[in-house]
Each structure stands twice: as structure tokens, then as C-alpha cells.
């Protein structure tokens, strides 16, 4: 069989390197020549957010688009051409792709004219040696026998909260089987919570590396001075510019009445452990906080009668239910909430490449936050999922 790079998948002069896929098989990574980027270097960077300059080299937005601001003595789109040696093609330079196992090459001005920044789990001058404690690509199975009995019991057991244990059978990930299942790059689940930009994990499939690669990262939160105010004034029909930011939930689109809706595919379905009437009483706060977490606009999906699709969620009957309880009807212990994601402002913002294209990717992100214990949301969520729009309506 052809090795992945033999099919020359990288466009526009991008360099193909072999890397290990999530299932342990061989896959490829393209190292693109600016201004190209993407899985196969098929996209053209239009902002510094999209341009991958070598580590340590800043990006500069110019009238002709973004470019890497090369240090003195280096030039070229990736700053890999030494001005002293126009070819820049000494065997030891970055042009020869000396860094192995997905490491990035940083040109330097002293011999050997490069420095490797290695991927997690690798070290050495060319990232050729596994580091002292190589990170296991993924635990193949759940190591603790006890976890098997605990999975699916609606309790997040921290000792079972690992990929191998399926995030305690979904108990720790809002019942999302594997939030990172679409992510090609290894270890992104480990890097999700490190507050550092990991470019290999910044794709939509890898849940945008928890927004670590965007200005201010995920630490850019709604100003606490504004937060209560923004919840009170969310979707109140009055444009509050202080709340009209992605981290404050876009003011419930109060400032976007002239902008056409851009709905993500599908419906985001949440099970919240609050009965419908209680949830609806604080729906502005609920939607504002969730919009702020997802950095886009959320709203209730409406049924044919124009009513918000918030349905009672009943306690699953264990069979040993008392006769009195059965006569009263099933106990309502929560709400099933159907939400639409409106990306109209997310896609208009300067960093418009981190919007959730569909409800399932938003569900995966919420599941990932929950799995790494970073879901700062005061409403008790039981599970979350994306459903296609054609899903039959609940009566």
C-alpha cells in the first residue's frame, strides 16, 4: 500500500510528514508554506489567526494580507531563507525538514541554523527520541475493572474519567461518547486544558484547542462587572455594546437585528436537571451563559405553535416505583431543551474561524469541557447531543 505521503496530499508546496493517527495507524501532517494552511494546505490565510508562522516569529497584518515578520537575516514566506545564503538549502536548515515526529522547525542564525520544537512525547535535537515519559497515544482499554461497573451510573467517577474508560461511560462528558473522536491529532484531549496554543489541536475537529489559539484564549471571559447586567439584558430588545461580544453572548443578538441569521446545522439538545417552569424563569441567564461558553448565539427552537421547545424530563422508572408515585404520574426531574445555534455574529467577527458548524460539534465541545472539569455553568446538565433538524418533534 502507498504510504500516506506518497499520494502527495499537501498542496501549494506544503511538506508532508508522516505521523501516527489516533488509531495507531500511519497518517500525514502537512507543514504549509505561508500563506497557505489547512489539512492539505488548501486554504489561503486572510488573517494572522490563520497564518502559521514558525514558533517565535510574529505575524504581521499588511495591506496585502498576513505575513510572517522575519527576524533580521531571514526571509521568505516562512522566514526559512537565510539572506546570507539565498538558497537557504543547507542540509541542516529547516528546508530539509529535519524535525521528526511532527516537530516544528525554527530557523536560528547560528549553526546548525535550526532548532526543533518537538511534539509532546518526543525530544532530542531532531525530535528523534521518545521523551523520558512518553505519552501513551491512548489507553487501549479501561485499566480499572471497577470502572466497568460504574460506567453509566450518572456519577462522574474521577478515577474512570479517561479516554480508555470512555470518560466513565459518558458520565463525565455529558454522555458524549468521545468528544475528540473526530480529532486526527493525538493527545489533543491532554492539551485541551493547558491554556497554551497547540496548533495541531486548533481545528474544529479537535474542538479549537479550547480556544487557546484565539486572542485572549479561553481566559477572555465576560467582564464580571458586565456579567450580571448582560444576563439581565440578554435579548431584551435593546443593543448593549458592552455585552455585544462573543464572551458575553452577543447580547442575545439585540445588536444584530439587521444581520441575517446563519444557523448551524442541527439542533443542540440538552437535558437539564431543572423542571421546565423553573428553567424558563431564568431562560435569559441560561442562554446568555451558554452562548458565552460557546462564543456564539443560542436560542430556543420553537415548535409549530411558536412555543419554546422545552419539554419535561421524567425520572427513569426503576421498576420498584411506589404505587402512589405511579398514580401521580412520572416525576418531572428536569427539562429536555432544544436549542438553535445562530452564527451570524460569530462568523462576522474578526476571528470568524472558530464557530461551531453544527450542533454536534457544539455538543462535543461541551462534553469536552465537562470531561476536563472546566464547564463553568451553574445549570445542572445531564447530557448533551446534536440532532439533525429532521428529528421528529416531541409532543
Amino acid at each position: 500500500a502507498l504510504s500516506p505521503c506518497e499520494s502527495q496530499p499537501c498542496q501549494h508546496g506544503g511538506q508532508c510528514r508522516h505521523s501516527l493517527g489516533r488509531g495507531g495507524g500511519l497518517t500525514f501532517t502537512c507543514h504549509c508554506v505561508p500563506p497557505f494552511w489547512g489539512l492539505r494546505c488548501e486554504r489561503v490565510a486572510r488573517s494572522c489567526r490563520e497564518l502559521q508562522c514558525p514558533v517565535g516569529i510574529p505575524c504581521q497584518q499588511t495591506a496585502r494580507g498576513p505575513r510572517c515578520a522575519c527576524p533580521p537575516g531571514l526571509s521568505g514566506p516562512s522566514c526559512r531563507v537565510s539572506r546570507a545564503s539565498p538558497s537557504g538549502a543547507t542540509n541542516a536548515s529547516c528546508a530539509s525538514a529535519p524535525c521528526l515526529h511532527g516537530g516544528s522547525c525554527l530557523p536560528v542564525q547560528s549553526v546548525p541554523f535550526f532548532r526543533c520544537v518537538c511534539a509532546p512525547g518526543w525530544g532530542g535535537p531532531r525530535c528523534e527520541t521518545p521523551s523520558a515519559a512518553p505519552e501513551v497515544p491512548e489507553e487501549p482499554r479501561c485499566p480499572r475493572a471497577a470502572c466497568q461497573a460504574k460506567r453509566g451510573d450518572q456519577n462522574c467517577d474521577r478515577e474512570c474519567n479517561t479516554p480508555g474508560c470512555g470518560w466513565d461511560g459518558g458520565d463525565c462528558s455529558l454522555n458524549v461518547d468521545d468528544p475528540w473522536r473526530q480529532c486526527e491529532a493525538l493527545q489533543c484531549w491532554r492539551l485541551f486544558n493547558n491554556s497554551r496554543c497547540d496548533p495541531a489541536c486548533s481545528s474544529p475537529a479537535c474542538l479549537y484547542d479550547n480556544f487557546d489559539c484565539y486572542s485572549g484564549g479561553r481566559d477572555r471571559t465576560c467582564n464580571p462587572v458586565y456579567e450580571k447586567y448582560c444576563a439581565d439584558h440578554f435579548a431584551d430588545g435593546r443593543c448593549d455594546q458592552g455585552c455585544n461580544t462573543e464572551e458575553c453572548g452577543w447580547d442575545g443578538l439585540d445588536c444584530a437585528s439587521e444581520v441575517p441569521a446563519l444557523l448551524a446545522r442541527g439542533v443542540l439538545v440538552l437535558t437539564v436537571l431543572l423542571p421546565p417552569e423553573e428553567l424558563l424563569r431564568s431562560s435569559a441567564d441560561f442562554l446568555q451563559r451558554l452562548s458565552a461558553i460557546l462564543r456564539t448565539s443560542l436560542r430556543f427552537r420553537l415548535d409549530a405553535r411558536g412555543q419554546a421547545m422545552v419539554f419535561p424530563y421524567h425520572r427513569p422508572s426503576p421498576g420498584s416505583e411506589s404505587r402512589v408515585r405511579r398514580e401521580l404520574g412520572p416525576e418531572v426531574i428536569g427539562s429536555v431543551v432544544m436549542l438553535e445555534i445562530d452564527n451570524r455574529l460569530c462568523l462576522q467577527s474578526a476571528e470568524n474561524d472558530h464557530c461551531f458548524p453544527d450542533a454536534q460539534s457544539a455538543a462535543d465541545y461541551l462534553g469536552a469541557l465537562s470531561a476536563v472539569e472546566r464547564l463553568d455553568f451553574p445549570y445542572p446538565l445531564r447530557d448533551v447531543r446534536g440532532e439533525p433538524l429532521e428529528a421528529p418533534e416531541q409532543s
Partner: antibody, heavy 119, light 107 residues
């Protein structure tokens, strides 16, 4: 053109009930926050309450003097806003206006409907 | 609740006069203040929103200023059609509240 027309006002005894309607036309009613404002004869304006769009839960807020007695609702299929007034008092006598809220504020008001509470 | 206090409660002025009406909030409302004009038997009409923004279609002789607790509505040169009652209103927090009104009469 954009229009709001209130109806349902009239004479009612103290303790009685009345339901006001506000028919909207010329705009997508379902997406707007709607308000009720009243004005007692010869007096100033008093905010009664508001209702958000159903896409945000149709949350209502009320002024203290009417809380627990008045209920604001909406029927988006009929493009109509309602004010259900129970346990009416003489001090509820006023012209009641419905108004549309948006980013540039309540730019559309109805002509008002008079409610008289008297024995 | 936030109390809104307008002054004066009434004033007499002539055509061409410069008229100033003030409004004070019992607590800071940032710039969340609107000014309305109302003529007898008519619905109120919005003049100024967010303290200083002129609503479209409103003549430029009307202007608003202030933030925090103290606000001003100014009519630079009073016209015959400006004789009316003017109300300030805060929409910083529910319940939204109006000032008691200022009646501008012909001298």
C-alpha cells in the same frame, strides 16, 4: 407600515378583570420584545411590564404595583400581545399603550386604549 | 427601584428660546436614559436614546447629554411644535421608570 393597535379597554368594577389586546402588523412580531406602558388621566407615564421573544423563553417582567395581578402574554401566530388584568383597582384607571422594543428603543407605540375602574 | 426626578416640573418659554430640562437618577444608570415627547391625546414619541443619541427623524435642535446619575435635554431654539410634555426614562434595570414629566408651555 409598522402599526400597533390596542383594544379591549372599557369600564370595569374594582376587583374585576379585563384583557387588553395589541394587534401588530408590518413587522415580524415574533422576534420583538414588547412592552405595556400606562398613563393615568392627567398623570405621567408608568411602565407596566414586558415580554421577551419566545426564542428566549418569553420571559416577563412587571412593575411592582401590578405584579401578581397582571399577566403579559403573546400569541405569535396571531401577531398579538395581551395584558390580562385581574383584581383591578381604581388606581389602575389609565390609558394603556403597547410598544415595540428594539435595538433603537421603543420606536413604535399604539394609540392607547382607556381602562376605567370604577364602581 | 430606580427613582427618576425631573426638573423643572413645568416651564414657560418663547419661540427661539434655549430650553434645558434635567433628569436625575437615584443611582447610576450609565447612559441608559431616553427622552420622550408627548402631546395631549397622543402616544409618546422617542427623541433621544442612550442619553445622547438622536432618534431618526427628530430635528437636530434636540440634544441630550450626561451619564451616571445626571442628564440633560436641551432644545437649542424652541419651535411652536415643541410645546409639549417631556419625560425621561431609565432602561438600565427593570422595573423601567419614568420621570414625572416637564411641561413646556408658551410664555
Amino acid at each position: 407600515q409598522v402599526q400597533l393597535v390596542e383594544s379591549g379597554g372599557g369600564l370595569v368594577k374594582p376587583g374585576g378583570s379585563l384583557r387588553l389586546s395589541c394587534a401588530a402588523s408590518g413587522f415580524t412580531f415574533s422576534t420583538y420584545v414588547m412592552h405595556w406602558v400606562r398613563q393615568a388621566p392627567g398623570k405621567g407615564l408608568e411602565w407596566v411590564g414586558r415580554i421577551r421573544s419566545n426564542t428566549y423563553g418569553g420571559i416577563t417582567d412587571y412593575a411592582a404595583p401590578v405584579k401578581g395581578r397582571f399577566t403579559i402574554s403573546r400569541d405569535d401566530s396571531k401577531n398579538t400581545l395581551y395584558l390580562q388584568m385581574n383584581s383591578l383597582k381604581t388606581e389602575d384607571t389609565a390609558v394603556y399603550y403597547c410598544a415595540r422594543a428594539e435595538a433603537r428603543y421603543r420606536d413604535v407605540w399604539g394609540q392607547g386604549t382607556l381602562v376605567t375602574v370604577s364602581s | 427601584d430606580i427613582q427618576m426626578t425631573q426638573s423643572p416640573s413645568s416651564l414657560s418659554a418663547s419661540v427661539g428660546d434655549r430650553v434645558t430640562i434635567t433628569c436625575r437618577a437615584s443611582q447610576s444608570i450609565s447612559s441608559h436614559l431616553n427622552w420622550y415627547q408627548q402631546k395631549p391625546g397622543k402616544a409618546p414619541k422617542l427623541l433621544i436614546y442612550a442619553a445622547s443619541n438622536l432618534q431618526s427623524g427628530v430635528p437636530s435642535r434636540f440634544s441630550g447629554s450626561g451619564s451616571g446619575t445626571d442628564f440633560t435635554l436641551t432644545i437649542s431654539s424652541l419651535q411652536p411644535e415643541d410645546f409639549a410634555t417631556y419625560y425621561c426614562q431609565q432602561d438600565y434595570h427593570t422595573p423601567f421608570t419614568f420621570g414625572q414629566g416637564t411641561k413646556v408651555e408658551i410664555k
